[in-house]
C-alpha cells in the first residue's frame, strides 16, 4: 500500500533559530520515511533532507527573512512514493520569537509605569507589535493593552496611584499570526500621590431638650481608593449654615469622631492627609432638629443569591447617583459601634458577601439617598444573610376543647430564637392509636382550629415552627374530646 | 552585480559619500554592508542596511559613517575622515534580509586621504 | 568591542594536507553560531566560505568545514590545493551589533 500523501503542511519560524514544518498523517502503519525539500532564496537554492517522523527542522542557514520559502515532502515506503502539495511560507508572516526580557520598570507620573524590555533576538529593525498584561496583585484578572509598532520602551498609563501591580510582555513581528510566550512577570508599586476622598457618614442621636445632639462621624478609605494608601490622619472642619463661623480639628488618628451641634443645619467636612498633601473634602450636610428630610426611595427588597445577600430598591428620581446602606444586628444595643456602612454609587442594589454577617442573625438594613451633601430618609428592611431552624419550637396550649373541636394557642418565639422568618406554622394531631394529622397556617396566625376530632378521645398535639432552613417542634401535650 | 563608486583622494577633514549601485536583485530583499581594508591591512566591517531600511553601525564608526539606501543604491556618508582612513572600502550583498554571510562582492573602491 | 583572535598566522600546509584555522571570540556570538569564514586572494574582493559557523556557501568546494560554537570556532580545509593559498578571516556577529568585527586574519601558505 502507498503511503498517505502528506498533508496539512504547517511550519512555524523559531526567529533564528529553524523552520520546523509538521505534517499528517502524524503515525503511519507501515514503515513510511520521508524526504523533506525546501525551496528558499527566492527559489534560488534548494535543501533536502531525510526525515523518519512527521516533523522537521530546517537549520537557520536555510530561512532567512524576507525570504519566501516552499516546503514540499514526499513520503516512501516499500510500495513507493507519494508527494505532498508544495505549500509556501512567507518567513516573518510565520515568525515566532522567545519571550521577551523586561530590563525595568519604572513608576512615571503616578498612574504610569514605563517599561523597558527587549527581544532575545536581533529583531532587524521589523516592526513590532507588543502586548502588555496587568493586574493588581491581589486580582486574578489580566487586562490587556496592545502597543502598535512598538519601540523597547513603553508606557502603561490610567493605573491606579500607590497599587501594587503584576505585569508582563509579549510581542511579535507586525507581520506574524504568532505571539511570543509572556515574559517573566514583574511587580512594581505605582507612585503615591495625595490620599483619595473620604466616604463620610454620620450618626445622629436625639436631640436634648435645648435642641443640641451629638453626632458621630465616621470615614474610611473610599472603596476605589489604593490598597496601600497610608494616611498621617484626618482634618475636620465644620460651621453652622447660618454662621461663618468655622471650626476645625486637626490631627486627628482615628477614623470617628463625636462633636456636640446645635439645632441648626451643619456642614461638616473632613480630609485625610500625607506627605504629599491632603485630600479633597468628603462633605455631608447635617440637618436642622425640626427639618423635614426627603424621601427618595419607593420600595426595597432583600433575598439570598448564594454566596451573596442582595438588597434591591427603586428610587423615585434619577438624580440620586450616591446611597448610603447601614447594616446592623437587630440585637444590638446602640448603633456605635456596632453598626457598620458602605457608600453605593451609581447603582439602586447592594451586596455582601453571606460569610461577612453573623448567620441566624437579624439584621436592619437601612438606605439613605444622598444628593448632593444632603441625606435623605432612610428605607429599611430586615434580612437574615443565613437562615437556620428555630432554636425552640412555639409553646402551646389548647383551649376551648369541645366534642369535635378544639383551639389549640401558641405563643410567638422570641425574636433571639427564630434563627430566620418564621414563613408558617404546621399544627400535628394525633388520636390515641390514630394517624398523625397536620395543618399549617401563616406566620402571623398564633391559633388554629381543629375540627372533625372523634368525641371523647385522647389526642396529643405540637406545634412546629418553620423558616426556610426548615421547622422545629414545641412540646407535646396532650388532650381529650368531651364527651 | 555590486559596484562601489565615488573614492578618490581627499585631505583630513573633508566629507566624502561613496556610493554602491546594484543590479539583478532587489535590495527590499537583502542586506547590504560595508567593509573597509588599508593597504596591507586586515578587513574591518563597517556596518550593514538591512532590508527593512535598519541601519548597525561598529562602535568605532558611529557618528562618523553614516548608511542609506535608495531603491538600487546604497550610500557610505563619511565625515571627519583622517589619514587613517585611507583604505579599499567593499560594498557587499547578504544573504538574506539581515544575515553577515556576506555573499556578493563588489570590487571595492579606493579613499586616500593625505594631507 | 568583541575581539576575535585568529591564530596561528601564518600557516604553511603542503598540498593535499589539512589546515586548522581557529577563531576565538571574547564573548559568545548571536545565537552562538553568528560567525561566518572569508577567503581573500590579493587584489581581491573577499569571498564567503562558510556562514553560521557550519554553513557551506553555495559553490564552495566540500573541502572547507566550519564548526564550534559559541566562543571558540574552527575552519578546517582538507585536501589543500594550491588555489587555497589566501588570507581566512572570521567574521563573527553579536547581540549587540555595534560588536561585529572580523578576525585579523590568517594567512595560509600551500608549498
Known amino acids: 500500500v502507498l503511503p498517505t500523501k502528506p498533508e496539512n503542511i504547517s511550519c512555524v519560524f523559531y526567529f533564528d533559530r529553524n523552520l520546523t514544518c509538521t505534517w499528517r498523517p502524524e503515525k503511519e502503519t507501515n514503515d513510511t520515511s520521508y524526504i523533506v525539500t525546501l525551496t528558499y532564496s527566492y527559489g534560488k537554492s534548494n535543501y533536502s533532507d531525510n526525515a523518519t517522523e512527521a516533523s522537521y527542522s530546517f537549520p537557520r542557514s536555510c530561512a532567512m527573512p524576507p525570504d519566501i520559502c516552499s516546503v514540499e515532502v514526499q513520503a516512501q515506503n516499500g510500495d513507493g512514493k507519494v508527494k505532498s502539495d508544495i505549500t509556501y511560507w512567507h518567513l516573518i508572516s510565520i515568525a515566532k520569537t522567545e519571550p521577551p526580557i523586561i530590563l525595568s520598570v519604572n513608576p512615571i507620573c503616578n498612574r504610569m509605569f514605563q517599561i523597558q524590555w527587549k527581544p532575545r533576538e536581533k529583531t532587524r529593525g521589523f516592526p513590532l507589535v507588543c502586548m502588555l498584561r496587568f493586574r493588581t496583585v491581589n486580582s486574578s484578572h489580566w487586562t490587556e493593552v496592545n502597543f502598535e509598532n512598538c519601540k523597547q520602551v513603553c508606557n502603561l498609563t490610567g493605573l491606579q496611584a500607590f497599587t501594587e501591580y503584576v505585569l508582563a510582555l509579549r510581542f511579535r513581528f507586525n507581520d506574524s499570526r504568532y505571539w511570543s510566550k509572556w515574559s517573566k512577570e514583574e511587580t512594581r508599586v505605582t507612585m503615591e500621590e495625595v490620599p483619595h476622598v473620604l466616604d463620610l457618614w454620620r450618626i445622629l442621636e436625639p436631640a436634648d431638650m435645648n435642641g443640641d445632639r451629638k453626632v458621630r462621624l465616621l470615614w474610611k478609605k473610599a472603596r476605589g481608593a489604593p490598597v496601600l494608601e497610608k494616611t498621617f490622619g484626618y482634618h475636620i472642619q465644620y460651621f453652622a449654615e447660618n454662621s461663618t463661623n468655622l471650626t476645625e480639628i486637626n490631627n486627628i488618628t482615628t477614623q470617628q469622631y463625636e462633636l456636640l451641634l446645635m439645632s441648626q443645619a451643619h456642614s461638616v467636612s473632613v480630609t485625610s492627609f500625607n506627605s504629599l498633601g491632603k485630600s479633597q473634602e468628603a462633605i455631608l450636610r447635617i440637618p436642622d432638629v425640626h427639618e423635614k428630610t426627603f424621601q427618595y426611595i419607593k420600595s426595597m427588597k432583600a433575598y439570598i443569591a448564594e454566596p451573596l445577600l442582595v438588597v434591591n430598591w427603586q428610587s423615585s428620581i434619577p438624580a440620586v447617583d450616591t446611597w448610603i446602606v447601614e447594616w446592623l444586628p437587630e440585637a444590638a444595643m446602640s448603633k456605635f459601634p456596632a453598626l457598620s456602612w458602605e457608600s453605593v454609587s451609581q447603582v439602586t442594589n447592594w451586596t455582601i458577601e453571606q460569610d461577612k454577617l453573623k448567620p441566624f442573625t437579624c439584621y436592619n438594613i437601612s438606605v439613605y439617598p444622598v444628593l448632593g451633601h444632603r441625606v435623605g430618609e432612610p428605607y429599611s428592611i430586615q434580612a437574615y444573610a443565613k437562615e437556620g431552624t428555630p432554636l425552640k419550637g412555639p409553646e402551646t396550649r389548647v383551649e376551648n376543647i369541645g366534642l369535635r373541636t378544639a383551639t389549640i394557642t401558641w405563643k410567638e418565639i422570641p425574636k433571639s430564637a427564630r434563627n430566620g422568618f418564621i414563613n408558617n406554622y404546621t399544627v400535628f394531631y394525633q388520636a390515641e392509636g390514630g394517624k398523625e394529622l397536620s395543618k399549617t397556617v401563616n406566620s402571623h396566625a398564633l391559633q388554629c382550629d381543629l375540627e372533625s376530632l372523634t368525641r371523647r378521645t385522647s389526642y396529643t398535639v405540637w406545634v412546629m415552627a418553620s423558616t426556610r432552613a426548615g421547622g422545629t417542634n414545641g412540646v407535646r401535650i396532650n388532650f381529650k374530646t368531651l364527651s | 552585480s555590486v559596484e562601489e563608486s565615488g573614492g578618490r583622494l581627499v585631505t583630513p577633514g573633508t566629507p566624502l559619500t561613496l556610493t554602491c549601485t546594484v543590479s539583478?536583485?532587489?535590495?527590499?530583499?537583502?542586506?547590504m554592508s560595508w567593509v573597509r581594508q588599508a593597504p596591507g591591512k586586515g578587513l574591518e566591517w563597517i556596518g550593514i542596511?538591512?532590508?527593512?531600511?535598519t541601519t548597525y553601525s561598529a562602535s568605532w564608526a558611529k557618528g562618523r559613517f553614516t548608511i542609506s539606501k535608495t531603491s538600487t543604491t546604497v550610500d557610505l556618508k563619511m565625515t571627519s575622515l583622517t589619514t587613517e582612513d585611507t583604505a579599499t572600502y567593499f560594498c557587499a550583498r547578504s544573504y538574506g534580509g539581515y544575515s553577515l554571510a556576506i555573499s556578493l562582492w563588489g570590487p571595492g573602491t579606493l579613499v586616500t586621504v593625505s594631507s | 568591542a568583541a575581539v576575535l583572535t585568529q591564530t596561528p598566522s601564518p600557516v604553511s600546509a603542503a598540498v593535499g594536507g589539512t589546515v586548522t584555522i581557529n577563531c576565538q571570540s571574547s564573548q559568545s556570538v548571536y545565537m552562538n553560531n553568528e560567525l561566518s569564514w572569508f577567503q581573500q586572494k590579493p587584489g581581491q574582493p573577499p569571498k564567503l566560505l562558510i556562514y553560521y559557523a557550519a554553513t557551506l556557501a553555495s559553490g564552495v568546494p566540500s573541502r572547507f568545514k566550519g564548526s564550534g560554537s559559541g566562543t571558540e570556532f574552527t575552519l578546517t580545509i582538507s585536501g589543500v590545493q594550491c588555489d587555497d593559498a589566501a588570507t581566512y578571516y572570521c567574521l563573527g556577529g553579536y547581540d549587540d551589533d555595534a560588536d561585529n568585527a572580523f578576525g585579523g586574519g590568517t594567512e595560509v601558505v600551500v608549498k
Open positions: 539583478g536583485f532587489s535590495l527590499s530583499n537583502y542586506a
Open positions: 542596511i538591512t532590508y527593512g531600511d
